[in-house]
Amino acid sequence: SQVSQNCHNGSYEISVLMMGNSAFAEPLKNLEDAVNEGLEIVRGRLQNAGLNVTVNATFMYSDGLIHNSGDCRSSTCEGLDLLRKISNAQRMGCVLIGPSCTYSTFQMYLDTELSYPMISAGSFGLSCDYKETLTRLMSPARKLMYFLVNFWKTNDLPFKTYSWSTSYVYKNGTETEDCFWYLNALEASVSYFSHELGFKVVLRQDKEFQDILMDHNRKSNVIIMCGGPEFLYKLKGDRAVAEDIVIILVDLFNDQYFEDNVTAPDYMKNVLVLTLSPGNSLLNSSFSRNLSPTKRDFALAYLNGILLFGHMLKIFLENGENITTPKFAHAFRNLTFEGYDGPVTLDDWGDVDSTMVLLYTSVDTKKYKVLLTYDTHVNKTYPVDMSPTFTWKNSKLPNDITGRGPQ
């Protein structure tokens, strides 16, 4: 049913869903702090633009009686229950921030007539792609898939002279929410990744993974997995690895690689780590860039969600346009706005674009180094280190199939 929105006469409200089931185990208090920090910035920006309006957030908490797994497994109904609560209380804002779980976002989008924008920190799965009023502020699975296909096909770099067309994917079911959907997308038989590869097999058992490392009859030298170095070590330990094995470790939301005193453990020498650039601006902005670790990535996406709303509100108010319209609901895409940590770009479908970074371990220094960067906005790879000190033969990435000559 249609819910009236608290979104007019100079007073604009943001509905923030504070769900017990969340993509990341971030204390709700931290998310609340991030939202409040965002509100302060938005108020300042609107005031500077001569717009004398009120912007507030209403935090909608779930009772947690039924949906208490804490992760995303029981989130499907929790989101709808919260929407019902909003509906009964007639407390809908101009925009909905949250949910972060793919299940709940998909279901809420499906089961409601959304005439308002929905901003999510998460919703990584392919089922949340191409939703007209949904904006996602953390890299969705589609972006990862496009990088992998781009990288697999690349064969004209000094360190990668072979196109790849095969891969193993390790997926054992214990992944975090982001990893679950990233690997789910790679596994899906109808996905772009599967369509572009000639061979792809999912390894579901630890032993399967461990056996492949030295199996002379393996069908691919490349293994994709998702998680941090500790996750890899638990699985791989100090086992011997064939010299032409390449492990691609997807670890997008982990800044630990960019700490100055970090030395790469020995077990990372056969590994390329795919992560997000920790910030791409040459100049510091006027307000602090040093978010505390608890506010990294997930909480930052909440904060940026508030700033995005402020950006759109400012544009519509300056143009004298109504906020409670389908036009406003559909406007949160194909734009760049000033985020907390620098400019944030959203693509045509409202998904955040970013710079992904592929790291390798230097055999000389045992430090992580940038091999290349990838701009999701233009789907382009930019080599950085033209003569990497790899563990692989001739300091070049091997072919994906042992014994196959140049393509």
């Epitope: 960019f258 700490e259 100055d260 650039s277 920790p278 791409n280 040459l282 970074v357 430090k367 992580y368 180094k369 940038v370 091999l371 960067t373 930019y382 950085v384 280190d385």
Partner: nanobody, 123 residues
């Protein structure tokens, strides 16, 4: 003796491309943070791109998506690939190096500077 020598500048039409090189001698590029700067006639020198010693590129907003940086340690040379050039990119381009205190941040100042190479974007 530490030396940086830029090359590759010249006259190019708007929308065109150029690749600048910065050859280093007397030290290993790999251990240093490297920056490209430019100074347009009558203007102050401004930072364009920095490559941290860990290899992380950081761009000025004005060149993001158009300029890219890479490093070939075997040749001890840094490259600046400039695409979609505009008239406002006309300047003398300098490369500079700094013994890195941080592997992932651009240094506040640079110890060594090249002589510069002129880039003119004009039809």
């Amino acid at each position: 003796e530490v030396q940086l020598v830029e090359s590759g500048g010249g006259l190019v039409q708007p929308g065109g491309s150029l690749r600048l090189s910065c050859a280093a001698s007397g030290f290993t590029l790999d251990d240093y943070a490297i920056g490209w700067f430019r100074q347009a006639p009558g203007k102050e020198r401004e930072g364009v791109i920095c490559l941290t010693s860990g290899g992380l590129p950081k761009y000025a907003d004005s060149v993001k998506g158009r300029f890219t940086i890479s490093r070939d340690n075997a040749k001890n040379t840094l490259y600046l690939q400039m695409n979609s050039l505009r008239a406002e990119d006309t300047a003398v381009y300098y490369c500079a190096a700094s013994g890195a205190t941080s592997r992932w941040n651009c240094p506040p100042q640079y110890d060594h500077w090249g002589q510069g190479t002129m880039v003119t974007v004009s039809s």
